[in-house]
């Protein structure tokens, strides 16, 4: 194959791969017809002048996972056909000016996972055909104005996992073709107004895991093509009313792990493609009418692990397509009987870990397709007559960890539970809290005759009882995977959601196995 170095492998397809710790310099002679060269996991520490001079047909060059810390400015001379260059996962702190000069065909430049301290406009001024620039995982503290001005064809720019504390509003102004901009895991505290105004073709903007406190009202107003916007794990305390108003293509918006205290009505401007909205781990205390009314295609809404104590009866107006609603681990004490009335397609609702004392009899009146209801760990003493009778698809109902009052008033619920025992799951059953002589006994098998008779009749709306027939299709218990780690504190102690084990899934999701996804 035109002379393959002994420490490399060369394929018929003009591909050369050189790997191994014994390699301390670029192997020679490299086959003159090589089109792809990979130098991986070696002990090469520097690239000297023109080591690739005789392989001018090279299209792709990967020099990754080495000890590379120094490159001579002329290292890539004569590689005018090169389209892909990766220097990722090395130990580069400095890039010499002019290093990429002459690489007129270069489309992808990967400099990620090095130790680069700065970049300058002169570094990339020759790379006019560049489409992808990866700079994530370095030590960049700032990006000078003009750094990317010559990269007018750039479509993907990754600056994540650096140490950026601020961004100049002019740094991206010439990147009109940019589709993906990633700034995640930096130290940004605010984004100046106008920063993204020139990015008219932007489809993905990743700003998660920074320290952003405020969003400018018009920050995204020029980004009409934006499809994915990641704002999670910042310090955002409020959303300007119009901040999301002009994002009609948005299909992913993450806002979890911020400091949001309130959501104003209509804050989520028309987003016909948004199917999931994750708002867990904020400080939201109430939900006003029509707060989600523009999200008519929303299928999944996660509001768990907030401080919600009040939900206005019209809070969920417009969510006609919603299938999963997670409200677990909040501060709810009461719910209006009409709060879920518009959620005709709801299949799964998680209300566990709240302070609910009672439920209106009509709370699930219009939600006939409910398959799973999580009500464990609340303050429920009883439930209204017939509250679940019309829910023919209900296959998972969690009622444990409530202070059930096992007097004669509990009989209708006890009888329903007896008939519907498979729906309660096998892990934990509801037990009586009072009277004292039956405390700890299973609500399902309790002999109510020995309990203290009721001294009052609670005024709760009730349904005409619809009997549940055992010969209708059975819906077996479909409890979550070994969910012995049910969350009881307001906020779970975790550092990084990506490391949560699978057995902890309900702590965020609070959902069940009852429907597919």
């Amino acid at each position: 194959y035109h002379g393959c170095p002994s420490e490399c492998t060369c394929s018929r397809a003009s591909q050369v791969e050189c790997t191994g710790a014994r390699i301390v310099a670029v192997p020679t002679p490299l086959p003159w017809n090589a089109m792809s060269l990979q130098i991986l996991n070696t002990h090469i520490t520097e690239l000297n002048e023109s080591p690739f001079l005789n392989i001018s047909a090279l299209i792709a060059l990967r020099i990754e996972k080495n000890e590379l810390s120094r490159i001579t400015p002329g290292a890539f001379r004569n590689l005018g056909s090169l389209r892909y260059l990766s220097l990722a996962n090395n130990k580069l702190q400095v890039l010499p000016i002019g290093l990429f000069q002459g690489l007129d065909s270069l489309e992808s430049l990967l400099l990620s996972s090095n130790q680069l301290l700065q970049i300058q406009p002169a570094h990339f001024s020759q790379c006019s055909n560049l489409k992808e620039l990866q700079l994530h995982g370095n030590h960049l503290e700032y990006i000078p104005d003009g750094a990317f001005d010559h990269l007018v064809g750039l479509t993907k720019l990754n600056l994540g996992k650096n140490s950026l504390t601020h961004i100049s509003p002019r740094v991206f102004q010439h990147l009109g073709n940019l589709q993906v901009l990633r700034l995640y895991e930096n130290r940004l505290t605010d984004i100046p107004m106008g920063t993204f105004d020139g990015l008219v073709n932007l489809q993905e903007l990743a700003l998660q895991q920074n320290q952003i406190g405020l969003l400018s009202p018009g920050l995204f107003h020029n980004n009409h093509n934006l499809q994915r916007l990641y704002l999670s794990n910042n310090h955002i305390s409020q959303l300007p009313p119009s901040v999301f108003m002009q994002l009609p293509q948005l299909n992913r918006l993450t806002l979890f792990g911020n400091s949001l205290k309130e959501l104003s009505p209509g804050i989520f401007g028309p987003m016909p493609n948004l199917r999931e909205l994750w708002l867990y781990d904020n400080h939201i205390s109430s939900l006003p009418d029509n707060v989600f009314s523009n999200l008519r295609q929303l299928q999944v809404l996660i509001l768990s692990r907030n401080q919600i104590s009040f939900i206005s009866p019209g809070a969920f107006n417009g969510l006609t397509e919603l299938r999963e609603l997670s409200l677990h681990t909040n501060a709810l004490q009461d719910l209006d009987g009409n709060v879920f009335r518009m959620l005709a397609n709801l299949q799964n609702i998680s209300l566990q870990n709240n302070r609910l004392r009672q439920l209106p009899g009509n709370i699930f009146a219009n939600v006939n397709g409910l398959m799973a209801i999580q009500l464990q760990n609340n303050q429920l003493e009883n439930l209204p007559l017939g509250i679940f009778d019309h829910l023919g698809k209900l296959c998972e109902l969690r009622l444990y960890d409530n202070p059930w009052r096992c007097d004669s008033d509990i009989l209708p619920l006890r009888n329903w539970l007896l008939l519907n025992q498979p729906r309660l799951g096998t892990d934990t059953v509801p037990v009586c809290f009072s009277p004292a002589n039956v405390r700890g006994q299973s609500l399902i098998i309790i002999n109510v005759n020995v309990a203290v008779p009721s001294v009052h009749v609670p005024e709760v709306p009730s349904y005409p009882e619809t009997p549940w027939y055992p010969d209708t299709p059975s819906y077996p218990d479909t409890t979550s995977v070994s969910s012995t780690t049910e969350l009881t504190s307001p906020v779970e102690d975790y550092t990084d959601l990506t490391t949560i084990q699978v057995t902890d899934d309900r702590s965020v999701w609070g959902m069940t196995q009852a429907q597919s996804g």
């Epitope: 299928q299 005709a344 990506t498 699978v502 309900r506 597919s516």
Partner: antibody, heavy 119, light 110 residues
């Protein structure tokens, strides 16, 4: 280019376990749901369950609860499906597939992993 | 679980002719906004490939001779002009509840 590359074929004894991997590339792994689907010889397709890599959250088809365990390793952008207490009826091709949203169709599939259970 | 019944089990169609595959659900898989029905093509030794999502939305890169229609319980996949490369097994899938697939329809050249 979006790719899901699965581990190679396995031959296992009844009662043993198998762990199939699915290495994702070309997309943000934590931003998509990963589904697992079974196809027994000459049979149709059967949904096993899904995992959402960002939180490790799972949903299972009741039929496969206790049989399949779905996990992810976000550092290597790899999803895993472990099948336990293998029986001859677990002989099948197992696919991983990607879904954008939870209820969306599966738009990219792995090439499949054949698991044969035989004594 | 929702049962999906495909018909016919197999179908032989001349090149350039129309092929129609039906999928009936045991209960509605539609809401006012969506029909949670998707169609896949599977060739021998290959994984399934998404053709149509949400009953009628053509997946990008799929030839426009494929189309989907229907709502509620009855859905149809149509290949307007059968090509040689369309020989495969076609599956419908619903994601309205626990995901289930139809039994498949084998399409061959007559």
């Amino acid at each position: 280019e979006v790719q899901l590359v699965q581990s190679g074929a396995e031959v296992k004894k009844p009662g043993s376990s198998v762990k199939v991997s699915c290495k994702a590339s070309g997309f943000t792994f934590t931003d998509y749901y990963i589904h697992w689907v079974k196809q027994a010889p000459g049979q149709g397709l059967e949904w096993i369950g899904l995992v959402y890599p960002y939180i490790g959250g799972t949903n299972y088809n009741q039929k496969f609860k206790g049989k399949a365990t779905l996990t992810v390793d976000t550092s290597t952008t790899t999803a895993y499906m472990e099948m336990s207490s293998l029986r001859s009826e677990d002989t099948a091709v197992y696919y991983c597939a990607r879904g954008d949203n939870k209820y969306d169709a599966m738009d990219y599939w792995g090439q499949g992993t054949t698991v044969t259970v035989s004594s | 679980d929702i049962v999906l019944t495909q018909s016919p089990d197999s179908l032989a169609v001349s090149l350039g002719e129309r092929a129609t595959i039906n999928c009936r659900a045991s209960q509605s898989v539609s809401t006012s906004s969506y029909s949670y029905m998707h169609w896949y093509q599977q060739k021998p030794g290959q994984p399934p490939k998404l053709l149509i999502k949400y009953a009628s939305s053509l997946e990008s890169g799929v030839p426009d001779r494929f189309s989907g229609s229907g709502s509620g319980t009855d859905f149809t996949l149509t290949i307007s002009s059968l090509q040689a490369e369309d020989v495969a097994v076609y599956y419908c899938e619903q994601s309205h509840e626990i995901r289930t697939f139809g039994g498949g329809t084998k399409v061959e050249i007559k």
